[in-house]
């Protein structure tokens, strides 16, 4: 398994499960060392860090991008590196942390979440099985691009959103990544928290569609931070 090299995805300071946002509680799961998972209200963290080898950004966690660890280093030796925060230099969107994108070589804030090639989000749905076992963070499926003669329909296995038909994005669904519908106005979405707050991506939602952004539902402004419901709303 990948447990020995998964520590680059150890996540610290995770807020309470966001399952309530989708109407489901966070489920208990057991985890191998090096990974943090919700288990009721308890969390495990591992502080040591081991780099995860990669070939492209999609193989890294949501708070990471794939690059050579040294400037001008051997491009053949790449690892997952921590994403760059706002106002830091960048060369592509994937280098910037969730909620930001690369504009004119600088990571800038984006209220819309269209800019990263994939979806970043926390656990917003229950695993639905308190006896699930996670032996490690589920890495991205490595599929040959030759598979994609036609764009994937909803439910088709994918590697990235460009593999999916119009109106769909590529998002994790437990042990696979599949094409799912881009969210419409009024649908529940996941607002990305600060860096370090991303949970294990097991059941992802797509981003909000064009002209929409993920915002707190008006009648939920009074609710506590952990239970605020976000929906796709017009700008």
């Amino acid at each position: 398994t990948l447990n020995s090299v998964l520590n680059s995805n150890a996540i610290k300071n995770l807020p309470p499960p966001l399952g309530g946002a989708a109407g489901h509680p966070g489920s208990a799961v057991s985890a191998a060392p090096g990974i943090l998972y919700p288990g009721g209200n308890k969390y495990q963290t591992i502080d040591n860090y081991q780099p995860y080898p990669c070939a492209e950004d999609e193989e890294c966690g949501t708070d990471e991008y794939c690059a050579s660890p040294t400037r001008g280093g051997d491009a053949g030796v790449q690892i997952c590196l921590a994403c760059r925060k706002r106002r830091k230099r960048c060369m592509r969107h994937a280098m910037c942390c969730p909620g930001n994108y690369c504009k004119n070589g600088i990571c800038v804030s984006s209220d819309q979440n269209h800019f990263r090639g994939e979806i970043e989000e926390t656990i917003t749905e229950s695993f639905g099985n308190d006896h699930s076992t996670l032996d490690g963070y589920s890495r991205r499926t490595t599929l040959s691009s030759k598979m994609y003669h036609t764009k994937g329909q909803e439910g088709s296995v994918c590697l990235r959103s460009s593999d999916c038909a119009s109106g769909l994005c590529c998002a994790r669904h437990f042990w696979s990544k599949i094409c799912k519908p881009v969210l419409k106005e009024g649908q529940v979405c996941t607002k990305h928290r600060r860096k370090g707050s991303h949970g294990l991506e097991i059941f992802q939602r797509c981003y909000c569609g064009e002209g929409l952004s993920c915002r707190i539902q008006k009648d939920h402004h009074q609710a506590s931070n952990s239970s605020r419901l976000h929906t796709c709303q017009r700008h």
Epitope: G128, N129, S138, G155, V157
Partner: antibody
């Protein structure tokens, strides 16, 4: 040709162990999630366990949790199911199946019969 | 766990008939429903995934519809090779569960 071939089934006493294997060919095995699904004689289908393509995520049905272990060796294109503390109710044809192109199991083996009886 | 209830458990039909099988989930599964066909002594075969997407190589007489908790598999014109048992299965969240099956027999 895409193919899954199960082996390792047989007669075993209650409390005993068996290890099922599923050899894959004709597709990029390591890229896809795989599962074991069983069918008791004359009964319907029951999902047993799933493992992600890289082998780092596993799920089990409650009925086998703690007794069965799913694993895979991507270098050998083989899926395994280690079955311990077998019970009479585990008697079934065990199929291995894969999510090759979508969320349904679109590739299946021919099945291997496991009989638990004294 | 999400329970899947199929109906009818069996039906008799003739070649050329339009056949409808229903599947109901105990809670919403959005569109994460698959349909399988199984013939005696054989492994199941995926017909439809994600409620309505036809698996490659499956004849267009098979179609699926529904959303949330209620789903339907329709065979527009039953052919001799369609006499088999059909199962629905949810892939919304583990544990993945199947319906009890619908046996389609020759009238």
């Amino acid at each position: 040709e895409v193919q899954l071939l199960e082996s390792g089934g047989g007669l075993v006493q209650p409390g005993g162990s068996l290890r099922l294997s599923c050899a894959a060919s004709g597709f990029s095995f390591s890229s896809f999630a795989m599962a074991w699904v069983r069918q008791a004689p004359g009964k319907g289908l029951e999902w047993v366990s799933t493992i992600s393509g890289s082998g780092d995520v596993t799920y089990y049905a409650d009925s086998v949790k703690g007794r069965f272990t799913i694993s895979r060796d991507n270098s050998k294109n083989t899926l395994y199911l280690q079955m311990n503390s077998l019970r009479a109710e585990d008697t079934a044809v065990y199929y291995c199946a894969g999510h090759r192109s979508n969320i349904g199991w679109d590739v299946w083996g021919q099945g291997t019969l496991v009989t638990v009886s004294s | 766990d999400i329970q899947m209830t199929q109906s009818p458990s069996s039906l008799s039909a003739s070649v050329g008939d339009r056949v409808t099988i229903t599947c109901r989930a105990s809670q919403t599964i959005r569109t994460y429903l698959n349909w399988y066909q199984q013939k005696p002594g054989k492994a199941p075969k995926l017909l439809i995934y994600a409620t309505s997407s036809l698996q490659t190589g499956v004849p267009s007489r098979f179609s699926g519809s529904g959303s949330g908790t209620d789903f339907t598999l329709t065979i527009s014109s039953l052919q001799p090779e369609d006499f088999a048992t059909y199962y629905c299965q949810q892939s919304y969240r583990p544990p993945l569960t199947f319906g009890g099956g619908t046996k389609v027999e020759i009238k």
